[in-house]
């Protein structure tokens, strides 16, 4: 793939990524009702990051929103902290990754900024995509404890009062924002990534990296560490083979002896 | 002004079928949940069916589960009870009315009679 | 199903008089969601549909006197009418609208003396 396709395709799925990041956290379905004891319910109930809702039979819904910081449990703080530090990144990235982007020519900026530019903006996607996966998932962890904890009240509860009046608790489960966050936030992540990996093919070689050559085996190898240019007759899954105690290992056999530092 | 009249109803013997029929008016049909109620001889109120808004959804009692249907047709503003398999205690006056919030049923019809009879 | 039981069966009162009935429901109609409680109550008069009254246990339908107030939580529900008006007189119904199958109180009828 080449590096304008990488970098172009990368900043496509971070910004379906990002928009999903955005959905996830302004939607209201962050947590429904548990249907399995009353699958026919007249009144439904769901909650958001920001407000509850309540759907009714009739068609009426009506919601609410969390108007106190403070009479909020500590960890939807956290996960509204989370997702909104992945919005703020994301945007950020977006902003950046446009001016990087190898299509658009912005005056005389060289391959070696966008290269910069491209790299930042990936590494501002991963950490988006990153709080919005943990941010999702922190939420779902207290959605699994609150429900195990209902179920277990639900249980224990049924015995007082004789059995004649009961009290029917309602349980929560994962909304769909939950589903659209983990899948937004692993897009992000995933354009992120392919952002970074295409930072390596922008790097002009000769700029950054001067040709160095080592007397191995009575041959003169070439050895370049950069990644290759898109110019050079080098198919991207072509390996580098680093000549190692004159010519003695190629990094293949390395690999196979374990060194210290396979082991961090 | 809602209004809302319904017909269909009549003496059938047991074992029988019936079509209930409300003509919805004074409102927008479409945008409400619809419910049918029933009211035995001994004035006892019980719920039969509802529909919801987008037609999706229908809800019964046990009572009449598998041999009640309840349906609606927006474009004719009307709402049906398809009732099948009709028993002696299924006689009662049968009213057509509209959710509103609360799940309250703010508009009732002024009924129509089934007797099921031998 | 949700059992409703309506206390007393029927009511004698005279014009003026400030009138009480209640209605206990065998399972919780109080919502976590809204912290609204889904009991309804109808008004019945002879030859006649029913008409709303009060939806979500306290809140008057609109056209309904002031006379009219409806309390309570949980299971527990009054409907209350301040001063009993001629016109008032006829069987008032409570109903579960929280979870289906929806189910009706036997009712209290109001009579005068």
């Known amino acids: 793939m080449s590096v304008t396709a990488c970098q172009g395709l990368g900043f496509v799925v971070s910004l379906i990524g990002f928009a999903g990041i955005i959905a996830a956290t302004c939607m209201d379905q962050w947590s429904t009702q548990d249907l399995y004891n009353n699958p026919v319910t007249a009144v439904f109930n769901y909650q958001g990051l920001w407000r509850s809702c309540v759907r009714e039979s009739s068609g009426f819904t009506e919601c609410r929103g969390y108007f106190t910081l403070l009479g909020l449990p500590a960890m939807l703080q956290a996960v509204r902290a989370l997702m909104i530090v992945g919005i703020v990144l994301g945007v950020i990235g977006i902003l950046v990754s446009i001016f990087a982007l190898k299509c658009i020519r912005i005056g005389s900026m060289d391959d070696s900024a966008k290269a910069k530019m491209t790299l930042t903006s990936g590494i501002l996607f991963i950490i988006s995509g990153i709080c919005a996966i943990i941010g999702v998932s922190v939420f779902a962890n207290m959605l699994v404890t609150n429900f195990w904890m209902s179920t277990a009240n639900m249980y224990s509860g049924m015995g007082g009062m004789g059995g004649m009046v009961q009290t029917v608790q309602t349980r929560y489960t994962f909304g769909a924002a939950l589903f659209v966050g983990w899948v937004a936030g692993g897009l992000t992540l995933i354009g992120g990534v392919m952002m970074c990996i295409a930072c390596r093919g922008l790097t002009p070689d000769d700029s950054n990296f001067k040709a160095v050559s080592y007397h191995a085996s009575g041959q003169n190898v070439a050895y370049r560490p950069g990644g290759f240019k898109a110019s050079t007759g080098f198919g991207s899954n072509t390996r580098n083979k680093k000549i190692y105690d004159g010519g003695a290992r190629t990094e293949d056999d390395e690999q196979s002896h374990p060194t210290k530092y396979d082991y961090v | 002004d809602v209004k809302l009249v319904e017909s269909g109803g009549g003496l059938v013997k047991p074992g029988g079928s019936l079509k209930l029929s409300c003509a919805a008016s004074?409102?927008?049909?479409?945008?409400?949940?619809m419910s049918w109620v029933r009211q035995t001889p001994e004035k006892r109120l019980e719920w039969v069916a509802t529909i919801i808004i987008g037609g999706s959804y229908t809800y019964y009692p046990d009572s009449v589960k598998g041999r009640f249907t309840i349906s609606r047709d927006n474009a004719k503003n009307t709402l049906y009870l398809q009732m099948s398999s009709l028993k002696s205690e299924d006689t009662a006056m049968y009213y057509c009315t509209r959710l509103v919030k609360g799940n309250a049923m703010d508009y009732w019809g002024q009924g129509t009679s089934v007797t099921v009879s031998s | 199903d949700i059992l409703m039981t309506q206390s007393p069966s029927s009511l004698t009162v005279t014009a003026g008089e400030k009138v009480t009935m209640t209605c206990k429901s065998s399972?919780?109609?109080?919502?976590?969601?809204?912290?609204?409680?889904?009991l309804t109550w109808y008004q019945q008069k002879p030859g006649q549909p029913p008409k709303l009254l009060i939806y979500?246990?306290?809140s008057r339908e609109s056209g309904v006197p002031d006379r009219f107030t409806g309390s309570g939580s949980g299971t527990d529900f009054t409907l209350t009418i301040s001063s009993v008006q001629a016109e008032d007189l006829a069987v008032y119904y409570c109903?579960?609208?929280?979870?289906?199958?929806?189910?009706f109180g036997a009712g209290t009828k109001l009579e005068l003396k």
């Open positions: 004074g409102f927008t049909f479409t945008s409400y949940t």
């Open positions: 979500w246990a306290s």
């Open positions: 109903q579960n609208d929280y979870s289906y199958p929806f189910t």
């Open positions: 399972q919780s109609l109080l919502n976590s969601g809204n912290q609204k409680n889904y």
